[in-house]
Interface confidence: low
């Protein structure tokens, strides 16, 4: 039975040209995390494998930094980065947990904050 829950940064905003940290946290389960995938809609950004470490997709390697923890830092944001991001936790024996974050990249300095974590 899958008992775990994922907390995420929720709906967040950031300025064009800035950077943002995407965070997911899996709790309430003793399952072992074997791999975490970060995806932007249907596009793979990065993988953190428990044995092999991090892999950043070549098309994002100049703008994506792994971490902290199992999170992901996006840099040099553009308006095209607006959209849904998913953290996909592959665990044993539970299976797959997925968290969703919506990022809006703004031209102005207006910032919306997520419910769980604050992103200044």
């Amino acid at each position: 039975m899958m008992t775990g829950t994922i907390e995420t940064t929720g709906n967040i905003s950031a300025e064009k040209g800035g950077s943002i940290i995407l965070q997911c946290h899996l709790s309430s389960t003793t399952a072992q995390v074997t791999q975490v995938n970060w995806e932007q809609q249907d596009q793979l950004l990065a993988i953190c494998n428990a044995d092999l470490g991090w892999h950043i997709s070549p098309s994002f390697k100049d703008r994506v930094a792994p971490g902290p923890g199992l999170g992901l830092t996006l840099q040099s944001l553009t308006v095209n980065d607006t959209g849904e991001y998913f953290c996909i936790y592959h665990t044993y024996p539970d299976g797959t947990y997925t968290g969703r974050i919506f990022l809006e990249v703004l031209e102005s300095s207006v910032a919306e904050h997520g419910a769980r974590f604050q992103i200044p």
């Epitope: 950077s19 953190c48 428990a50 902290p68």
Partner: nanobody, 113 residues
Framework: EVQLVESGGGLVQPGGSLRLSCAAS????????MGWFRQAPGKEREFVAA????????AYADSVKGRFTISADNSKNTAYLQMNSLKPEDTAVYYC??????WGQGTLVTVSS
């Protein structure tokens, strides 16, 4: 090999302040991020705050927003967590972690009168 060493923990009264440090050694990458996490007795480790190493992005848990400030000194390979207005519920072992899954040994923060 990367090593993370936390320091600065201790016993403090409610309302007091502490500054934790996390010194990283053995690192060659210039582009990474650091986070602070904590684990209270009988509870799971939880996210506290994070910072990209250029300082351009930070993130905080709601429970510490406005009280804790994360910062980093790239020249010293050190991340900091300034904790103000401490509460008894902030009592925990505080750990720093990096993107590769390296963890420090933790530093105990006890908030009690």
């Amino acid at each position: 090999e990367v090593q993370l060493v936390e320091s600065g923990g201790g016993l403090v009264q409610p309302g007091g302040s502490l500054r934790l440090s996390c010194a990283a050694s053995g690192r060659t990458e210039a582009n990474y991020a650091m986070g602070w996490f904590r684990q209270a007795p009988g509870k799971e480790r939880e996210f506290v705050a994070a910072i990209s190493w250029d300082g351009g992005a930070t993130a905080y848990a709601d429970s510490v927003k406005g009280r804790f400030t994360i910062s980093a000194d790239n020249s010293k390979n050190t991340a900091y967590l300034q904790m103000n207005s401490l509460k008894p519920e902030d009592t925990a072992v505080y750990y720093c972690g990096d993107y590769e899954g390296h963890w420090g040994q933790g530093t105990l923060v006890t908030v009690s009168s």
